[in-house]
Interface confidence: low
């Protein structure tokens, strides 16, 4: 059936366009041939001008951006909120773990404080930085903790008679710590647990932050001119014929949207994989892959490692006495 | 400065826990997030349809606009877009994604690879060792998912997990101390706080 005759005076079109663009100079008084139109190609007289067409295209693209943003609002909020909650939660766990460890030293080995507090503090600062993405080696962190602790344990608990004036025995003791496996297999155990749990935690946070980036990227996509033309055709060209109340056909809308969003939809495959991979990671985040479990239990393992040193104290003192004799002689002088 | 003292030690076993789980763990928060994220798994493929359903589209009207003319909603013309001499929809799709989309796809590929690499191999941790098979009693630990309700119906096995304390209000200090380690009874080991 032929379209109904356009509004003889373009009055309806004028009042609608007024809402989009105050100032009426672009709307024809009466229908015109519209030979200059590039998008809303008329089948007869039209109430649209080239300038109006441009305005419609701009509005259509803005509409599309707003629709896209409202579509992703709930998802975006979900990931942003959770990324913040987990970031905060992990920081709290690290803070608690540090305090548990310091408290263990204070209650069980008061002679090792405050040096132990300092080493523990440095260790957990590194842990926090690692989770946030710093390029720190976990094994180095753990080694540094035990390398720093052993000289204090030796001079304060195992051989408290050593004068504190000269400290060059410390370097020898740091070396002896590794050579003699002073703490047994505890440092290795801590390395394994801490590195596994922190790696998983770090990648979990990275994944959430990338999720936000993905949504932000698609949220702020600028749609192409071609897309703008298709949207204008669908949403606004009917107005040129005075058909103000007509809505686009559903199938037609789907075709247009698929065209406009062809690029965005390509993300789908990787987005699905992202969620399923994240689920797999989360399912495995327990025991040594759960930083909460590992870090909050760390003070207990460190306690065990010091007890191990104490248990082997006699043998160690003799061996270290020989190994670091040169340093000790210089100290006694 | 104040904070909550908590129980610290956990038994290395899987617990029987009633389906109502009260105090939460970080792991339950993670699982809840994943469940919610999974409801968005088709987000991108569903976007065109979502946008059409949230913008004016003829639903109950007999007539609708196909880009060129007014047509019957169920006619063949309704799906046509009247763009034949404008530009080709196929061409638009062939252009490929914008550079910014290509970049984000590359980042997704990279994180997906990392996530797969990091995921715990099924055989390793998920293998049930003897102590997890419930040979020991299925008691709940303070630092684990609590037993809520009576045993029997509605009981499920959940993973052993330290309780997470979200204590943001106060900074901790060294005086907030775990008690001396009691090797005799790990189950009932407590953190005590010292007070001035």
């Amino acid at each position: 059936q032929p379209p109904p005759p356009p509004d003889a005076t373009c009055h309806q079109v004028r009042s609608f366009f007024q809402r989009l663009q105050p100032g009426l100079k672009w709307v024809p008084e009466t229908p015109v041939p519209g030979s200059d139109l590039q998008v809303c190609l008329p089948k007869g007289p039209t109430c649209c001008s080239r300038k109006m067409e441009e305005k419609y295209q701009l509005t259509a693209r803005l509409n599309m951006e707003q629709l896209l943003q409202s579509a992703s609002m709930e998802l975006k909020f979900l990931i942003i909120q959770n990324a913040a909650v987990f970031q905060e939660a992990f920081e709290i766990v690290v803070r608690h773990a540090k305090n548990y460890t310091n408290a263990m030293f204070k209650n069980n080995y008061p002679s090792l404080t405050p040096q132990a507090f300092e080493f523990v503090g440095e260790f957990f600062t590194d842990v926090s930085l690692y989770i946030l993405g710093s390029d720190i080696n976990v094994d180095d962190m753990v080694n540094e903790l035990f390398d720093s602790l052993f000289p204090v344990i030796y001079t304060q608990m195992m051989n408290p008679g050593l004068p504190e004036s000269v400290l060059d025995i410390n370097e020898c003791l740091r070396g002896a710590r590794r050579d003699l496996k002073v703490f047994g297999s505890f440092p290795k155990l801590i390395m394994t647990q801490v590195s596994k749990s922190l790696q998983v935690t770090r990648i979990f946070l990275q994944a959430l932050n990338l999720g936000i980036e993905v949504i932000n990227t698609t949220d702020h996509l600028k749609f192409s001119k071609d897309c703008g033309r298709m949207l204008t055709r669908m949403w606004y060209c009917s107005y040129c014929q005075g058909l103000m109340m007509v809505k686009p056909c559903g199938g037609y809308c789907n075709v247009v949207m698929q065209g406009c969003m062809a690029g965005v939809v390509e993300i789908d495959k990787y987005w699905r994989e992202y969620i399923l991979s994240l689920e797999e990671l989360v399912n495995g985040m327990y025991r040594i892959y759960d930083m909460e479990n590992v870090l909050l239990g760390l003070f207990s393992t460190i306690h065990d490692s010091i007890q191990y040193v104490q248990k082997n104290g006699g043998k160690l003192t003799t061996t270290i006495g020989k190994l670091c004799a040169h340093s000790q002689q210089r100290q006694y002088r | 400065s104040a904070y909550y003292p908590e129980d610290l030690f956990i038994d290395k076993k899987i617990l029987k826990v009633a389906h109502v789980e009260h105090e939460e763990t970080l792991s339950s928060r993670r699982r809840e997030l994943i469940q919610k994220l999974k409801s968005f798994i088709n987000f991108y493929s569903a976007l065109p349809g979502y946008i059409c359903s949230h913008s004016p589209v003829a639903e109950n009207d007999t007539l609708c606009w196909n880009g060129q003319e007014l047509v019957e909603r169920y006619s063949q013309k309704a799906a046509r877009n009247g763009m034949k001499n404008q530009f080709n929809l196929h061409e638009l799709k062939m252009k490929g994604p914008e550079p910014v989309v290509s970049q984000i796809i590359d980042k997704l590929k990279h994180i997906n690879q990392l996530l797969r690499t990091m995921s715990v191999p099924k055989g390793k941790v998920l293998d049930k060792s003897l102590d997890e098979e419930g040979l020991e009693s299925g008691d709940c630990g303070d630092d684990e998912d609590e037993c809520i309700g009576s045993s029997g119906d509605g009981m499920v096995k959940v993973k052993n997990q330290l309780r997470f304390l979200a204590e943001l209000a106060y900074d901790l200090d060294v005086d907030d101390a775990p008690g001396n380690k009691q090797h005799g009874n790990q189950k009932d080991n407590e953190i005590t706080t010292s007070h001035s």
Partner: antibody, heavy 120, light 112 residues
Framework: AVQLVESGGGLVRPGGSLKLSCAAS????????MSWVRQTPETRLEWVAY????????YYPDSVKGRFTISRDNAKNTLYLQMSSLKSEDTAMYYC?????????????WGQGTLVTVSA | DVVMTQTPLSLPVSLGDQASISCRSS???????????LHWYLQKPGQSPKVLIY???NRFSGVPDRFSGSGSGTDFTLKISRVEAEDLGVYFC?????????FGGGTKLEIK
Amino acid sequence: AVQLVESGGGLVRPGGSLKLSCAASGFAFSTYGMSWVRQTPETRLEWVAYISSGGATTYYPDSVKGRFTISRDNAKNTLYLQMSSLKSEDTAMYYCASLSIMIRGWFAYWGQGTLVTVSA
Amino acid sequence: DVVMTQTPLSLPVSLGDQASISCRSSQSLVHSNGNTYLHWYLQKPGQSPKVLIYKVSNRFSGVPDRFSGSGSGTDFTLKISRVEAEDLGVYFCSQSTHVPYTFGGGTKLEIK
């Protein structure tokens, strides 16, 4: 400082409804399980509702089950209690309280309360 | 539900005296994990309840050491070694071993 501020209390007829709110600040609300605890005119305390930090789990004792609904909006740091089919025995001061997550059932922070009076 | 019974209902004391409040539960509060979830709260006039002691005998941070908790199974006691003016108010015991969590009826500590 931690603050829990209840509002929405008032006088309501038996069978009526009321919605209480609790605005939280000074702590990570979205990581805490929350509860409503009421105190009757005879000063007796009763635990009436619980909601987990993400809102997935709720719990009600038999005395209010089916009549009260606890909910939360973590974006707004707000806890709610929708009360319907109110009875005279629901007259009480209603407190919102946060649960310590590590110590089972230990109400750590309490608000100042909002008074609900159910009377004809 | 577990019924918590507190005695006495009212406890008049002189400042500096020792005060003792008893709390009895209708069933054992020992959880299957070995812990006993019996807590004490203090509600000062015009205020909301505040935590004092958790799990029978652990003082909350900042609680003076004149407060101590003891007991096991079904019988528990809160002691204040030397009552001070700021200790006046209503003391509640509470259990969270069994769901629903329940409270005692309260004991009012007042000056003689």
